[in-house]
Amino acid sequence: KKEDGESTAPTARPKVLRCKCHHHCPEDSVNNICSTDGYCFTMIEEDDSGTPVVTSGCLGLEGSDFQCRDTPIPHQRRSIECCTERNECNKDLHPTLPPLKDRDFVDGPIHHKHHHHHHHHH
């Protein structure tokens, strides 16, 4: 039984970590800083044109283990790194693109990459 005065509504975990964000900034972010109860991340990925675009932001605790694990996706070159050790720790993350497959250098079947689109297009 709840003590008197104690709310029965689930209490949100405090958002304690501040992260640099770029192209993943929530609407309430100020000066390209977001807050999270989870992780900061920096990601490098090829956009549709093959350009290596870097984005960064906050990941909520829910599901972030999976997102930070950076499981390879076929035909998509991307890499993500996460951190929690201090505010804006993702400024110092430096994920690198996985190497190109040999098939990209010889005429062969075309592989279309599937992207989750960001707020920019190249």
Partner: antibody, heavy 116, light 107 residues
């Protein structure tokens, strides 16, 4: 080895058009987008636009929208840029450039001279 | 359009020196910046992508840094073959835009 070959020079008359070519070799042409860049002495570099060789989709710098037309010929792995209504302002070196992730290759450049 | 400003048009250096070429974006471009080297009569050559990632084959004396609006290309232990023009380019939004370039010359 990834290479982009461009003709060395084109001499054209004011008001005329010219079609510049950029032949790609050493990679799958349709997987790298092709960019075009203009360089005039002492004026730095200007991005004209880019084309997706697979779909033919283009994106232009507004400044060059009525000046440049980008196309590709997939069978010959060649990207082309047509420049129209040429004036002395269009005299420049034009580069094609292709990139994919951590590879970035520029063509040798074509010098376009507009003169009567 | 995003303006990329390279305030120093010329920089004098000596072989063995360390030199920093700077570039300022008119708005936040994250780390989506290229650095190019161009020698007379040659095409530009890409040195750095995503502000700090060195292209394969580029000597490690070339280092890129910065994020947001301020970017730096540092050449440590300058060699005579490094004398060239250096351009930054943002690719965070269209149209892609270049700095006007900085010419590195011998003192």
């Amino acid at each position: 080895q990834v290479q982009l070959q461009q003709p060395g020079a084109e001499l054209v008359k004011p008001g005329a058009s010219v079609k510049l070519s950029c032949k790609a070799s050493g990679y799958t042409f349709t997987t790298y987008w092709m960019h075009w860049v203009k360089q005039r002495p002492g004026r730095g570099l200007e991005w004209i636009g880019r084309i997706d060789p697979n779909s033919g989709g283009t994106k232009y710098n507004e400044k060059f929208k009525s000046k440049a037309t980008l196309t590709v010929d997939k069978p010959s792995s060649t990207a082309c840029m047509q420049l129209s209504s040429l004036t002395s302002e269009d005299s420049a070196v034009y580069y094609c450039a292709s990139r994919r992730g951590d590879i970035d290759v520029w063509g040798t450049g074509t010098t376009v001279t507009v003169s009567s | 359009d995003i303006v990329m400003t390279q305030s120093q048009k010329f920089m004098s250096t000596s072989v063995g020196d360390r030199v920093s070429v700077t570039c300022k974006a008119s708005q936040n471009v994250g780390t989506n910046v290229f650095w190019y080297q161009q020698k007379p009569g040659q095409s530009p050559k890409a040195l750095i992508y995503a502000a700090s990632y060195r292209y394969s084959g580029v000597p490690d004396r070339f280092t890129g840094s910065g994020s947001g609006t301020d970017f730096t290309l540092t050449i440590s232990n300058v060699q005579s073959e490094d004398l060239a023009d250096y351009f930054c380019q943002q690719y965070d939004s269209y149209p892609l835009t270049f700095g006007d370039g900085t010419k590195l010359e011998l003192r």
